[in-house]
């Protein structure tokens, strides 16, 4: 058994999570990961899912009944969704960090607007476009 | 050209991002996307990117002047990296939306969250997982 | 209220171009996507084009790519089908159809509003 | 291909239900909208359903959409079968490069 699943089960009982009644209304993530097998989708999904995991986690870093089962979930999501990669944990850490409030970072964000788009489309480096991607313009 | 570089030219004098000045200290996002050439790492980045330039047009919704070069950039921002499919629009939305701070958004997520990580890693579903992804535990 | 007329339809040779217009009112034009779609006499509805609002990129059937152009005119709510080539199996009701408002997550449903189409006859 | 697969035709008495199934030949069902189209002999296709299983204003409860991943289709289910239901029926989606597809059509007759 992977070692996240003791200390959700933990979690649970702290948010008083196990009751069936969470359930309803309709899950969060889980029907959402379900409409999407692709790859590439599931990363824009879950990368949504997993910065909201680490902000949850961030506002109960001081509760000291939690701390271990939280330090151990973080632990196991770099491993399994950032491959245990620091770089690209930080990079992505950056990237949920930024203000958009900040004037600054506004500035930088407009400034940087036009070469974000022209890679936003897979493969639009490598000119490997697939056949969705395919764009017409008169 | 793409439509959307005449709408960004418009919100860089608008923000007055033009400027050399502004490219100090660092880029927010053009260094981080340097990093990563896998589509699916790039998705993880970009999905970050994308939600934030969706917050900070947000923000600016009502100012009238820049109303038509946002809607023309988030159009093509939809076209792009949604491939105008509305279903993986609405789903990212969706995410992006929630509040960690609600009670019953919190108690789902923890609810959530053993599902969630089983999904985590690439292929984990379909058994196809690639080396990096194979994972030995005592 | 929401109106999409289509004109241009008529008979004409095979081999020879038409091109056919579709006018709306009634919604901000320049926001939405606007889908071309067919019916021949008898048969089911078929895909042919679709033109993006603001950023106006193209998509066509694979089937037809080539011969048929769509291009828009926001400043005068209109969009246009150029059809070249023209052959019998091209006979069909012509519909103009409103597509989604890409620029706003909560646009009202794809294909919602259609017009009442143009008749496009290719005979000799 | 990316064909979307119906019945040619469907026929039942007024009061009951009918389903009609929208099987999808490449690709995941739940990875793009569907929409269910009702078209009256002459007429022009009408929403009846939308996004799987909305319904716009003006469409009676009686009519509802779904979608089953086991069997990677959609369904348009009407209830309460009334003469007036009588029409031709499209399922409607997407393909890869999310270009509109369109299922043959179901014509359903409402007995006697």
């Known amino acids: 058994q992977d070692p996240y699943v003791k200390e959700a089960e933990n979690l649970k009982k702290y948010f008083n999570a196990g009751h069936s009644d969470v359930a309803d209304n309709g899950t969060l993530f889980l029907g959402i990961l379900k409409n999407w097998k692709e790859e590439s989708d599931r990363k824009i999904m879950q990368s949504q899912i997993v910065s909201f995991y680490f902000k949850l986690f961030k506002n109960f870093k001081d509760d000291q009944s939690i701390q271990k089962s939280v330090e151990t979930i973080k632990e196991d999501m770099n491993v399994k969704f950032f491959n245990s990669n620091k770089k690209k944990r930080d990079d992505f850490e950056k990237l949920t960090n930024y203000s958009v409030t900040d004037l600054n970072v506004q500035r930088k964000a407009i400034h940087e607007l036009i070469q974000v788009m022209a890679e936003l489309s897979p493969a639009a480096k490598t000119g490997k476009r697939k056949r969705s991607q395919m764009l017409f313009r008169g | 050209q793409d439509p959307y570089v005449k709408e960004a030219e418009n919100l860089k004098k608008y923000f007055n991002a033009g400027h050399s000045d502004v490219a100090d200290n660092g880029t927010l996002f053009l260094g981080i996307l340097k990093n990563w050439k896998e589509e699916s790492d790039r998705k993880i980045m970009q999905s970050q990117i994308v939600s934030f330039y969706f917050k900070l047009f947000k923000n600016f919704k009502d100012d009238q002047s820049i109303q038509k070069s946002v809607e023309t950039i988030k159009e093509d921002m939809n076209v792009k990296f949604f491939n105008s499919n509305k279903k993986k629009r609405d789903d990212f939305e969706k995410l992006t939306n929630y509040s960690v701070t609600d009670l019953n958004v919190q108690r789902k997520a923890i609810h959530e969250l053993i599902q969630v990580m089983a999904e985590l890693s690439p292929a984990a579903k379909t058994g196809k997982r690639k080396r990096s992804q194979m994972l030995f535990r005592g | 209220e929401v109106q999409l007329v289509e004109s241009g339809g008529g008979l004409v040779k095979p081999g020879d171009s038409l091109t056919v217009s579709c006018v709306a009112s009634?919604?901000?034009?320049?926001?939405?996507?606007i889908h071309w779609v067919r019916q021949a006499p008898g048969k089911g509805l078929e895909w042919v084009a679709t033109i993006s609002g603001r950023t106006k990129y193209m998509f066509y059937s694979d089937s037809l790519r080539g011969r048929f152009t769509v291009s828009r005119d926001n400043a005068n709510n209109s969009v246009y089908l150029h059809m070249s080539s023209l052959r019998g199996e091209d006979t069909a009701l012509y519909y103009c159809v409103r597509g989604y408002d890409h620029s706003d997550s909560n646009s009202a449903a794809d294909l919602l509003h259609w017009g009442r189409g143009t008749l496009v006859t290719v005979s000799s | 291909n990316f064909m979307l697969t119906q019945p040619h035709s469907v026929s039942e008495s007024p009061g009951k239900t009918i389903t009609i199934s929208c099987t999808r030949g490449r690709g995941y069902i739940a990875s793009y909208y569907v929409q269910w189209y009702q078209q009256r002999p002459g007429g022009v296709p009408k929403i009846v359903v939308f996004e799987d299983t909305q319904r716009p204003s003006g469409v009676p409860d009686r009519i509802s959409g779904s979608i089953d991943t086991s069997t990677n289709s959609a369904s348009l289910t009407i209830s309460g079968l009334q003469t007036e239901d009588e029409a031709d029926y499209y399922c409607?989606?997407?393909?890869?490069?999310?270009?509109?597809?369109f299922g043959g059509g179901t014509k359903l007759t409402v007995l006697g």
């Open positions: 009634g919604f901000t034009f320049s926001n939405y996507f």
């Open positions: 409607q989606s997407y393909d890869d490069a999310n270009h509109v597809i």
